[in-house]
Interface confidence: low
């Protein structure tokens, strides 16, 4: 279904005469009759198989024809058809003189014809107008034409029906070729399937309208990508629904037993940050100016020995200041004005000249270091403390400060981890080289036997249609997570499928 449109533009009849050569009195009051028919190699009279249309009187002799389409007028002329456009046509345009107001064929004298043109050819459906100009001995007609599809018809021949809709059966508009173009938020062959909120989990979430994300049992969150942990789980997480995997520092079936050494003992001093690194194990992150396992020792900015070449460090309120020995200068006494002649090497160090005596290098005896052998070797440099113990210089000797669980001069002895009975629910404790291991009694599992193992309600595969089964530990029952298209407690019912063709 479509419309053949003919736009008359100019008609020239300068002498104001009829086809017979007789002049019109007082001028040729011109109207047009149009006949559209099937393709004929030679256009001949006969039925206008595609339709006819007539105009009112449009002008006298020569005139321009105004485009009146916007005001609901008759130019372009409309020749609708209710069949598949064949791609070819024949067109006859007759210009007639109307002596009076009656334009019916029987009311006109037989010689009222001014001119007649006949064309035929191929014409594809499209928005572009074809321009043409036909000239006879006495007249000239300028016009354009095209074929466009009627509303809801598309394709090369206006044969494809497509009606936009936005209801239960589809949400789409029609493309120029008649194919469906889904409205924003819809997808599928007939645009019936909503596009869920961006990021909504494919298996765990679904939607009934666009930009929605509804969660299946056992899942939560804006995108249904967060599992719901075991009912009553306090300080734990899950990777699949109904689990309760304890956070660091928490234990027990519901992760409500505080195993957090930092919280219980506050071992870190001077505003340090405490981090649990396992049961009864912690790490202190010291604030600037403090050191030690528990950040209990105040650190001078001079402790880092920033002054070179024997310079002495002096604390200041904001930082430090280096007092340089003779022959040195700079913020850290890093620049030298000395040579070997000035005996710059301390503590028996031997001087070696470099760059033709421009500067020097000291070779230090054992237990001394520094560019001028001015520093005693730090007894802690060799890091003698084992198992993460901290070495502290204390006068002429040194000592090791051990981490919890270790003892001995060099923190080399392991304190038994099992002494604190860490295994829950009657588990047996075994001391290992790097910690401990619990052997759990029947019905319990986990690092510390803190998880009660339930009867596996999913063992009998109760869920249908490839649904995922989860065990609810609090009730020893199962929950089925249905795939798209199935519902029911066991995912046994398919969702009603859409009709095969919704039009």
């Amino acid at each position: 279904s479509g419309v053949f449109q003919l736009q008359l533009q100019e008609f020239i009849n300068e002498r104001g005469v009829l086809a017979s050569g007789r002049p019109c009195e007082p001028g040729c009051r011109t109207f047009f009759r149009v006949c559209l028919k099937h393709f004929q190699a030679v256009v001949s009279p006969g039925p206008c198989t595609f339709g006819t249309v007539s105009t009112p009187v449009l002008g006298t002799n020569s005139f321009a024809v105004r485009d009146d389409s916007s005001g609901g007028g008759r130019n372009p002329l409309q020749l609708p058809f209710n069949f598949t456009w064949p791609g070819t046509f024949s067109l006859i345009i007759e210009a007639w003189h109307a002596p009076g107001d009656d334009l019916r064929p029987e009311a006109l004298p037989p010689d009222a014809l001014i001119s007649k043109i006949a064309i035929q050819g191929s014409l594809a459906v499209g928005q572009n107008w074809l321009l043409d100009e036909q000239t006879s001995t006495l007249t000239r007609l300028r016009y354009s034409y095209r074929v466009i599809c009627s509303d809801n018809y598309y394709g090369d021949n206006c044969s494809r029906l497509c009606k936009k809709r936005n209801d239960h059966f589809g949400h789409y508009v029609c493309q120029p070729d008649g194919n469906l173009s889904c409205l924003p938020g819809w997808t599928g062959e007939y645009c019936q399937q909503p596009i869920c909120l961006s990021g909504c989990h494919e298996q765990n979430g679904y939607c009934s309208k666009p930009a929605e994300c509804l969660c299946r049992p056992g899942w939560q969150g804006r995108l249904c990508n967060e599992c719901i942990p075991h009912n009553g789980c306090r300080h734990g997480t899950c990777s699949t629904p109904w689990q309760c995997t304890c956070d660091e520092g928490w234990g027990g079936l519901f992760c409500d037993q505080d195993l957090n050494y930092c919280t219980h003992h506050s071992p870190c001093k001077n505003g340090a940050t405490c981090s649990n690194s396992g049961q009864r194990s912690y790490t202190c992150t010291c604030r600037p100016g403090y050191t030690g396992v528990d950040c209990e020792l105040e650190l001078s900015e001079c402790d880092s020995n920033p002054c070179r070449n024997g310079g002495s460090c002096k604390d200041q309120e904001d930082g430090y200041h280096c007092l340089c020995p003779p022959g040195y200068y700079g913020l850290h006494c890093e620049h030298s004005t000395l040579s070997c002649a000035d005996s710059p090497c301390f503590n028996g160090g031997s001087c070696r000249e470099r760059n033709q005596g421009a500067n020097y290098a000291c070779e230090c005896p054992p237990n001394f270091t520094g560019s001028n052998c001015e520093k005693k070797v730090d007894r802690c440099t060799s890091n003698p403390c084992a198992n993460g113990g901290q070495c502290l210089n204390r006068g002429p000797s040194r000592m090791c400060r051990c981490r919890p669980g270790f003892t001995g001069t060099y923190c080399e002895l392991h304190v038994s981890d099992c002494a604190r009975n860490p295994c829950a629910h009657g588990g047996t404790c075994h001391d290992l080289e790097n910690g401990l291991m619990c052997t759990c009694p029947a019905g319990f599992s986990g690092r510390r036997c803190e998880v009660r193992t339930s009867i596996d309600a999913c063992a009998s595969s109760p869920c249908f249609n490839r649904a995922t089964c989860y065990t609810d530990l609090s009730t020893d029952t199962f929950v089925c997570n249905c795939p798209y298209g199935f519902v029911g407690s066991r995912c046994e019912f398919p969702v009603g499928l859409p009709p095969s063709f919704p039009w």
Epitope: A64, D67, N128, W129, L130, L131, D132, S144
Partner: antibody, heavy 122, light 108 residues
Framework: QVQLVQSGAEVKKPGASVKVSCKAS????????MHWVRQAPGQGLEWMGI????????SYAQKFQGRVTMTRDTSTSTVYMELSSLRSEDTAVYYC???????????????WGQGTLVTVSS | EIVLTQSPATLSLSPGERATLSCRAS??????LAWYQQKPGQAPRLLIY???NRATGIPARFSGSGSGTDFTLTISSLEPEDFAVYYC??????????FGQGTKVEIK
Amino acid sequence: QVQLVQSGAEVKKPGASVKVSCKASGYTFTSYYMHWVRQAPGQGLEWMGIINPSGGSTSYAQKFQGRVTMTRDTSTSTVYMELSSLRSEDTAVYYCAREEYSGSSAEYFQHWGQGTLVTVSS
Amino acid sequence: EIVLTQSPATLSLSPGERATLSCRASQSVSSYLAWYQQKPGQAPRLLIYDASNRATGIPARFSGSGSGTDFTLTISSLEPEDFAVYYCQQRSNWPPWTFGQGTKVEIK
């Protein structure tokens, strides 16, 4: 977008001929009439003629009849305007302009070439 | 052929002022009249067609009126970029398409 690109400036001697080209792009070449308009230095606009690119038919202003020839090449979407027997008063900028006809600015000139200066001097 | 006469030949105004340009046809052209703007070294630019319709992208300060033989182009408040030559053109009776001789709007 619609573009009309004209050939470069020309200098001719009196009595010679000049052929100016106008290459169209961005639309269906055969669907729109093309006009030629000229403008002498410091003067107004003067319509020269029209060509139908679809069939090649033309219409010229009486003043240029016999001296002007408008042609087109659909394979390159180009129209040409040739003016012969040049005289000094033909010195002008020559424009091609596409005629709008469909619904809105009917038979007016929405799209113009950039113009070609033709200088006639001995 | 239809002759179009524009007046005044030159109009000297300041930015912000109202400009009124006239175009008179030697015989009726109904409403088949257009207005163009041309700046030095540039091609004309269509402003108004069919006497009163603004072309695409033309600011609202440009308006056209009239029918038959008397037509007016009004620029409600001149902007610096509006100083140019303005031509009227008819397409009622062709060939030829005819233009007026132009009105130059210059800065006072």
